[in-house]
C-alpha cells in the first residue's frame, strides 16, 4: 500500500447498451439470515477522506488499546505502529498487553516509494463500532517505516482486508478477516460506504465529520439506493474484477478490453485515485479533454500535479464528462455499468483552498500494475465484498456527491460477449520479484 496516490490510506448518463437490453434484474433475496437489513451500530463508523484514507476505530490487547486503523482492501496484513513516530499520536504498546504473543518472526514490506517493517505477533482485537466479538488475530507491530504514515491523517495502522495470497511475509499469515470469520459467527462478507465530502475538510472537520461506514458481516439497505449489481471476484488475492468496456460521456473508448485489465483490475479502498493502465489512461484523458474542450487546463493538471481553482461555488461540473466502467456480470454474456461524476474524479484539495477558491486535483492517474478502482470510484458507490459468494456488489451510494443534473449510477444489464477474454493472465513469476506497492 503506497501513499499519495496509493495510500495506505473517494441524468445525462449517455451511452447505448452494448447490444440488446435484457430484462432488468431484481434485488436478490438474502441468502443467509442476518446478512441484510440494519446494522445501526456500524453505520458511520469510518472517518477520513479519499486523499489520506478512511479509518475505523479498533482496540488491540488487554487491557484494550484504542487505535485508528486504515481500511485497505488492497492489502492483507493487519499492521499497526508499535514505536514512536513523529506522525503518530499513539501506538500499540505490546509490553502493556497481557494477551500479546510474539511469533518471533519479522516482516518487511517495501513499496514503490517507502516501506514498513516490523515484528509479527498475535493479540486480541475488536472493533468497538463493529460486531460484538473479540478475535485473536495476527498483528505486524511496525517498528520502522518510511513514507508510510501520513502527517495529520489520524490513523496509526492498516487493516488489510484482501486475501491471504498477498499477505506478507507469505500466505501462511492469516489475514484479520479470515480470523474473524473462523473464530466467530460473523458472515464472510463486509461492505463499504466511503463518503467523499465534495469540498475540502481541514483537520478538525475531518475529526468531527462522518467518513462513511464499514458494515462487517452484512449489507445495510439505508446506505444505498436502487439495486445492487454483482461482478465476480476473478481470483482471491486482491479483490480482482474484470472491466469489459469503458465509456466517457457515453462514448466507447473502443479498446481491446484486455487493455482495461492489464495486468489486473482491483477494488482498493487504500488507493486515492482511479488508476488506469498507461494506454487506457492516455485514451481516457484524451477523451476527457475532448469532452471538456471549451476549457483548456495545464498539462500538470492532467498529470495529477497542478491544482485548478475556481471561485468558490463556481466549479463548472457540467463541462466534465461522466465516466462509465462496465463490469462483468454474474450471468453469462451479461454486464452492468457503474458511472462516476467529475465530483468523484476531481478531488478537492484543502491545503491551498481559501474561502475565495475551490481547488481540485485530477484524481485519475496512470498505472503500471493494472486498473485500481480506488476511493475516487468507491466514493460513488456502496460496495459489497461478498467473499462467501466470491463476488463484489455495487449500488449507488446514499452519500455520494452529485449535482441537480447528474448522479452516479449503477445500471444494467447489458449484453456483452466473450467477457472471459477481457481478463489478463499474469505469467507466473517468482513471487520475490513482485513489487508490492502501486505507484
Amino acid at each position: 500500500t503506497q501513499h499519495g496516490i496509493r495510500l495506505p490510506l473517494r441524468s445525462g448518463l449517455g451511452g447505448a447498451p452494448l447490444g440488446l437490453r435484457l430484462p432488468r434484474e431484481t434485488d436478490e433475496e438474502p441468502e443467509e439470515p442476518g446478512r441484510r437489513g440494519s446494522f445501526v451500530e456500524m453505520v458511520d463508523n469510518l472517518r477520513g477522506k479519499s486523499g489520506q484514507g478512511y479509518y475505523v476505530e479498533m482496540t488491540v490487547g488487554s487491557p484494550p488499546q484504542t487505535l485508528n486503523i486504515l481500511v485497505d482492501t488492497g492489502s492483507s496484513n493487519f499492521a499497526v505502529g508499535a514505536a514512536p513516530h513523529p506522525f503518530l499520536h499513539r501506538y500499540y504498546q505490546r509490553q502493556l498487553s497481557s494477551t500479546y504473543r510474539d511469533l518471533r518472526k519479522g516482516v518487511y514490506v517495501p513499496y514503490t516509494q517507502g516501506k514498513w517493517e516490523g515484528e509479527l505477533g498475535t493479540d486480541l482485537v475488536s472493533i468497538p463500532h463493529g460486531p460484538n466479538v473479540t478475535v485473536r488475530a495476527n498483528i505486524a507491530a511496525i517498528t520502522e517505516s518510511d513514507k508510510f504514515f501520513i502527517n495529520g491523517s489520524n490513523w496509526e495502522g492498516i487493516l488489510g482486508l484482501a486475501y491471504a495470497e498477498i499477505a506478507r511475509p507469505d500466505d501462511s499469515l492469516e489475514p484479520f478477516f479470515d480470523s474473524l470469520v473462523k473464530q466467530t459467527h460473523v458472515p464472510n462478507l463486509f461492505s463499504l460506504q466511503l463518503c467523499g465530502a465534495g469540498f475540502p475538510l481541514n483537520q478538525s472537520e475531518v475529526l468531527a465529520s462522518v467518513g462513511g461506514s464499514m458494515i462487517i458481516g452484512g449489507i445495510d439497505h439505508s446506505l444505498y439506493t436502487g439495486s445492487l449489481w454483482y461482478t465476480p471476484i476473478r481470483r482471491e488475492w486482491y479483490y480482482e474484477v474484470i472491466i469489459v468496456r469503458v465509456e466517457i460521456n457515453g462514448q466507447d473508448l473502443k479498446m481491446d478490453c484486455k487493455e482495461y485489465n492489464y495486468d489486473k483490475s482491483i477494488v482498493d479502498s487504500g488507493t486515492t485515485n482511479l488508476r488506469l493502465p498507461k494506454k487506457v489512461f492516455e485514451a481516457a484523458v484524451k477523451s476527457i479533454k475532448a469532452a471538456s474542450s471549451t476549457e483548456k487546463f495545464p498539462d500538470g493538471f492532467w498529470l495529477g500535479e497542478q491544482l485548478v481553482c475556481w471561485q468558490a461555488g463556481t466549479t463548472p461540473w457540467n463541462i466534465f464528462p461522466v465516466i462509465s466502467l462496465y463490469l462483468m456480470g454474474e450471468v453469462t454474456n451479461q454486464s452492468f455499468r457503474i458511472t462516476i461524476l467529475p465530483q468523484q474524479y476531481l478531488r478537492p484539495v484543502e491545503d491551498v483552498a481559501t474561502s475565495q477558491d475551490d481547488c481540485y486535483k485530477f484524481a485519475i492517474s496512470q498505472s503500471s500494475t493494472g486498473t485500481v478502482m480506488g476511493a475516487v470510484i468507491m466514493e460513488g458507490f456502496y460496495v459489497v465484498f461478498d467473499r462467501a459468494r466470491k463476488r463484489i456488489g455495487f449500488a449507488v451510494s446514499a452519500c455520494h456527491v452529485h449535482d441537480e443534473f447528474r448522479t452516479a449510477a449503477v445500471e444494467g444489464p447489458f449484453v456483452t460477449l466473450d467477457m472471459e477474454d477481457c481478463g489478463y493472465n499474469i505469467p507466473q513469476t517468482d513471487e520475490s520479484t513482485l513489487m508490492t506497492g502501486r505507484a
Epitope: 471549451t294 476549457e295 483548456k296 487546463f297 495545464p298 500535479e305 497542478q306 481553482c309
Partner: antibody, heavy 120, light 108 residues
Framework: QLQLQESGPGLVKPSETLSLTCTVS??????????WGWIRQPPGKGLEWIGM???????WYNPSLKSRVTISVDTSKNQFSLKLSSVTAADTAVYYC????????????WGRGTLVTVSS | EIVLTQSPATLSLSPGERATLSCRAS??????LAWYQQKPGQAPRLLIY???KRATGIPARFSGSGSGTDFTLTISSLEPEDFAVYYC??????????FGGGTKVEIK
Amino acid sequence: QLQLQESGPGLVKPSETLSLTCTVSGGSISRGSYYWGWIRQPPGKGLEWIGMIYYSGSTWYNPSLKSRVTISVDTSKNQFSLKLSSVTAADTAVYYCARVGHGISYFDLWGRGTLVTVSS
Amino acid sequence: EIVLTQSPATLSLSPGERATLSCRASQSVSSYLAWYQQKPGQAPRLLIYDASKRATGIPARFSGSGSGTDFTLTISSLEPEDFAVYYCQQVYTWPPRTFGGGTKVEIK
C-alpha cells in the same frame, strides 16, 4: 517570430472604462496550446495578474478584479482585448499582454507594455 | 491562498560575483515555480520554469533549484546586464496568478 503589441489610450478618466488590445503577429492566436493573458504593474510596484483567455473564448479572471474585467478574443484579427470598468487612480499601471505557454502555466512571451494613467 | 516571499528585497553585488535569490512559498508548490527578470522600462522575461528548467535563449549562468516551499535562483557570475528586478511565480494552483514581491539586484 511571434510578437505581442499592446495598444489603446494612455489616459483614462476616473469612473470610465479602460480598453486595451493586444495584437499577435508571427503566429496564430488560435493555436491550441496557449492562453493569452493580461498582467499589470503599478509604478514602482510588483506584478498583478488580471486574467486570460483561450481562443475558444474561455476566460479566467483575478477574483479581486472580476467584477470589473472583461477579456475577449477576435481570432479573425488575431487580437485579444481587455476592458476594465469604473477605473480609479489605483488602476494606473503599465499593462502587459502575454502568452501563457510551457504547459499552459508560465508567461513565456510578453508585449512591451503600455502605460495607462487614470486621471481627470 | 499561497503567498510567495522573496528575499532579500535588495541584493547589492559587483559584476563577476555570485547572486543567490530566494523565494519561499507559504505551502508546497511542488516544482511549479518560475523566475522572471525585469529590467527598467522593459517587460518581464521568463528565465526559469518548473523550478529548474531554463527558458529558450537564457544563458547557462542562470540556474534554478528547489522544490516544495524553498526555491533559489542563482546567477553564477553577474554580468552588467543582469542587474534588474527578479520575480518568482507559482503555478501549482492554476490559473497562474501568484507572483512574489521581487528582489532587486543592484550594482554595489
